[in-house]
Each structure stands twice: as structure tokens, then as C-alpha cells.
């Protein structure tokens, strides 16, 4: 799993793209998104 900290420092990624990746993972893993 990729941590939020790592994702936020992944250069070239927009904030929406990070939200997108988190939400896709949430739909699979049912982690809480808040």
C-alpha cells in the first residue's frame, strides 16, 4: 500500500489525481475516506 505521505510527495500528480487514486482504492478496500 502507498501511504498518503508518499502520494502527496509524488511529483507531477494533481490533487484530484491523488483523490482519484484514493477513491478507487476506497471502492475496493472500503477504507473510510475522511
Amino acid at each position: 500500500a502507498v501511504s498518503e505521505h508518499q502520494l502527496l510527495h509524488d511529483k507531477g500528480k494533481s490533487i484530484q489525481d491523488l483523490r482519484r487514486r484514493f477513491f478507487l482504492h476506497h471502492l475496493i478496500a472500503e477504507i473510510h475516506t475522511a
Epitope: 507531477g12 490533487i15 489525481d17 482519484r20 477513491f23 478507487l24 482504492h25 471502492l27 472500503e30 475516506t33
Partner: antibody
């Protein structure tokens, strides 16, 4: 291979209800979020509903919120869309779609036509 | 709000290169989008997701003649050596999560005609 087969469409009067089904095969159904997307005759695509892998989380656009309910039975590998208080503008082909880790609507069914008319 | 704009139609000669444009609303210019292909009387098919930096991932069975690129709020789908089977509607889409609510919108689509 991923297969999604929708059923339950037909002609229904305004104000009535209809339940659509989507039978899934070729993958572990309980591992993926699923969605419904519709397309009115001669028109563009419109996202209708999304549900998480275990069914705990559901999402809807304002156009159907409170009228449509997405659900799933993972023991039957089946996705559902309960449509209440149907309107003429709900007339469309309804597609079910499966997500991947990379995208929302990676695989699509063939669709089922819903016609709301008196 | 989140809006995608596409030209309604485009025509290309057989074997030519095609470049289709999907434009995001200005305040959403950094967003990742998706491209879909819908051949006549068929369901949509996922083509690729396309990020602001032009990187993209293509769907199952999509020929490598299809590629993507980005510039500002514009997202491009390019088709090299266009073939008769590429005649279809090409639709872009974009999703976002706002305050734990999900929203997904589609562009109106560009109808591609292959001539000759």
C-alpha cells in the same frame, strides 16, 4: 474474461418502479466497486450510481438521489438498481460497469433499455 | 462546476492521423480524465486514463495506435493510421470526490468518421 449482463429493462409508466440486475462473471465480483451509467436515446452518457465492493458505500448524482438505490448481492455475483418514481427523462439504456485499481468504468455490459412512457 | 467540452464531429482520411480534444473547465485544468470509445450500437469501451502530465494507461485490447497527451486544460486522444473500425463516438469523462461525495461527468462526445 470479464462479463457483465444486464436485465430487467422494459416499458414502465411514469411514477412506477423497476429493478435492474447485472449478472457478473469472469472475475471476483466481491473485490470491485460497481456502477450504473445510462444513455438516453441519441444522447450522451450519464453516471447514475456507484457502490463499493462490500456494499457499504453508495454514491449518486443529484438527478437520481432519493429515487434510485444501488445494491449488490456478492453471494449471487449480482448488481442491482432499484428505480422508483420513474420519469420520462429516465428513459435510457442502462449499463453496468466495473472498476479496476486504475479507473472507474473499465468494463461495460451490453446494456438494458428502460422506457418510461404512459 | 466540472465541465468537459468536446467538438461534436470530425472526419479523417483512412490511414491519416487524428487528434481529438477534450477541454476541462479552467479551474479543473490539472485533472486526470478518461477516454471512451463507443462504436455504433455498442456499449462504451474504456480507452485510457490521461493525466495532466500526458502520461496515460490504456485499457485491455486497445491498439498502440491510440495515445494521449495534455496541454493546459486540454486532453488529447491521438489515433495514428486511422482504420475503418476506429469510426466511433469518442467520449471523455472525469470524476472527483468532494466532501465524501463522488461526482462523475462525461463530455458530449466527438463523432469520428473515417473517409475512403
Amino acid at each position: 474474461q470479464v462479463q457483465l449482463v444486464e436485465s430487467g429493462g422494459g416499458v414502465v409508466q411514469p411514477g412506477r418502479s423497476l429493478r435492474l440486475s447485472c449478472a457478473a462473471s469472469g472475475f471476483t465480483f466481491s473485490s470491485y466497486g460497481m456502477s450504473w451509467v445510462r444513455q438516453a436515446p441519441g444522447k450522451g452518457l450519464e453516471w447514475v450510481a456507484t457502490i463499493s465492493s462490500g456494499g457499504s458505500y453508495t454514491y449518486y448524482p443529484d438527478s437520481v438521489k432519493g429515487r434510485f438505490t444501488i445494491s449488490r448481492d456478492n453471494s449471487k455475483n449480482t448488481l442491482y438498481l432499484q428505480m422508483n418514481s420513474l420519469r420520462a427523462e429516465d428513459t435510457a439504456v442502462y449499463y453496468c460497469a466495473r472498476q479496476t485499481t486504475m479507473t472507474y468504468f473499465a468494463y461495460w455490459g451490453q446494456g438494458t433499455l428502460v422506457t418510461v412512457s404512459s | 462546476q466540472l465541465v468537459l467540452t468536446q467538438s461534436s464531429s470530425a472526419s479523417f482520411s483512412l490511414g491519416a492521423s487524428a487528434k481529438l480534444t477534450c477541454t476541462l473547465s479552467s479551474q479543473h485544468s490539472t485533472y486526470t480524465i478518461e477516454w471512451y470509445q463507443q462504436q455504433p450500437l455498442k456499449p462504451p469501451k474504456y480507452v485510457m486514463d490521461l493525466k495532466q502530465d500526458g502520461s496515460h494507461s490504456t485499457g485491455d485490447g486497445i491498439p498502440d495506435r491510440f495515445s494521449g497527451s495534455s496541454s493546459g486544460a486540454d486532453r488529447y486522444l491521438s489515433i495514428s493510421n486511422i482504420q475503418p473500425e476506429d469510426e466511433a463516438m469518442y467520449i471523455c469523462g472525469v470524476g472527483d470526490t468532494i466532501k465524501e461525495q463522488f461526482v462523475y461527468v462525461f463530455g458530449g462526445g466527438t463523432k469520428v468518421t473515417v473517409l475512403g
